[in-house]
């Protein structure tokens, strides 16, 4: 099991993963479900007016390790959590906006929320 903050290299899944998508659904999605070889994610960020907006969807394996890393962006409050342990696992992800005073650190943790053990199949 990967705990919050523990770094993990993405590994190829043996099969496709279905994720819930909201505000981030690709053309091929049906009933707000997308498919990926990588991760499901849920993200919260502030829009231009400062209103929190939640989006969710699929991240391809390639580049997802970077994307799932909560690297601070100057003048932008954002938090992302990723998961792979079951289909639509991102329904249970609830990232929160970081407090403003914490936005001066350089490297954030990778947020892999696993509510169940993630068995790696070989």
């Amino acid at each position: 099991k990967k705990e919050d903050g523990e770094s993990t290299a993405p590994t190829a899944r043996p099969k496709v993963l279905r994720c819930k998508c909201h505000h981030h659904c690709p053309e091929d999605s049906v009933n707000n479900i997308c498919s990926t070889d990588g991760y499901c994610f849920t993200m919260i960020e502030e829009d231009d007016s400062g209103t929190p907006v939640v989006t969710s969807g699929c991240l391809g394996l390639e580049g997802s390790d970077f994307q799932c890393r909560d690297t601070p962006i100057p003048h932008q409050r954002r938090s992302i959590e990723c998961c792979t342990e079951r289909n639509e696992c991102n329904k249970d992800l609830h990232p929160t906006l970081p407090p403003l005073k914490d936005r001066d650190f350089v490297d954030g943790p990778i947020h892999h929320k696993h509510h169940h053990h993630h068995h790696h199949h070989h």
Epitope: K15, V16, R18, P26, D28, G60, R86, N87, H121
Partner: antibody
Framework: QVQLQQPGAELVMPGASVKLSCKAS????????MHWVKQRPGQGLEWIGE????????TYNQKFKDKATLTVDKSSSTAYMQLINLTSEDSAVYYC??????????WGQGTALTVSS | DIVMTQSPSSLAMSVGQKVTMSCKSS????????????LAWYQQKPGQSPKLLVY???TRESGVPDRFIGSGSGTDFTLTISSVQAEDLADYFC?????????FGGGTKLEIK
């Protein structure tokens, strides 16, 4: 080697239900999706639905959502499809098929379902 | 639902001839994020279950003879048998796995003269 074993035939009465089985062997059952496909005599192939044995997540073709229910028994590596309120239109060969990435790399031999009184 | 249309519905060829069959989809099967076409081809011999020949439009499944060649992109796809053999007598189906429900073409029946 990968095998998906299905009974050769089933004969059931109109209005009844039937539970078709598909026993998987030669691979890790939870590592792949299982699909069910219908083929009527001399006709094409229709996808009924899919189930991920690892978390029992299912997706159905809307056409079959009130007709078919997909389940698995992980302990015996067996997938099941229950069909209800059977009519002559349900007479067909039903295949189970395995997928990793939504194309079907192994198929069972099919169960010929006959609905007749 | 994506509609898959195959043509011709049947054809008769002599051993050694080149065979081409077409599969057209009602919308593009090309995913922009990875530039792959989500289309597969299957062979179904009489009395048997379907067998995977090609996936991602042009990737031959392991163990499939190299005379089977898949090509095409977007909405137009072709399965070519470069030199047909007697054992290729079968129905051939295309399938899209771009968007659920996964759908199949009506098939092309290949007969050997």
């Amino acid at each position: 080697q990968v095998q998906l074993q299905q009974p050769g035939a089933e004969l059931v009465m109109p209005g009844a239900s039937v539970k078709l089985s598909c026993k998987a062997s030669g691979y890790t059952f939870t590592n792949y999706w299982m699909h069910w496909v219908k083929q009527r005599p001399g006709q094409g192939l229709e996808w009924i639905g899919e189930i991920d044995p690892s978390d029992v997540y299912t997706t159905y073709n809307q056409k079959f959502k009130d007709k078919a229910t997909l389940t698995v028994d992980k302990s015996s590596s067996t997938a099941y499809m229950q069909l209800i309120n059977l009519t002559s239109e349900d007479s067909a060969v039903y295949y189970c098929a395995r997928s990793g990435w939504d194309y079907f790399d192994y198929w069972g031999q099919g169960t010929a379902l006959t609905v007749s009184s | 639902d994506i509609v898959m249309t195959q043509s011709p519905s049947s054809l008769a060829m002599s051993v050694g001839q080149k065979v081409t069959m077409s599969c057209k989809s009602s919308q593009s099967l090309l995913k922009s994020n990875n530039q792959k076409n989500y289309l597969a081809w299957y062979q179904q011999k009489p009395g048997q279950s379907p067998k995977l020949l090609v996936y991602f439009a042009s990737t031959r499944e392991s163990g499939v003879p190299d005379r089977f060649i898949g090509s095409g992109s977007g909405t137009d796809f072709t399965l070519t048998i470069s030199s047909v053999q007697a054992e290729d007598l079968a129905d051939y189906f295309c399938q899209q796995y771009y968007s659920t429900p996964w759908t199949f073409g009506g098939g092309t029946k290949l007969e050997i003269k």
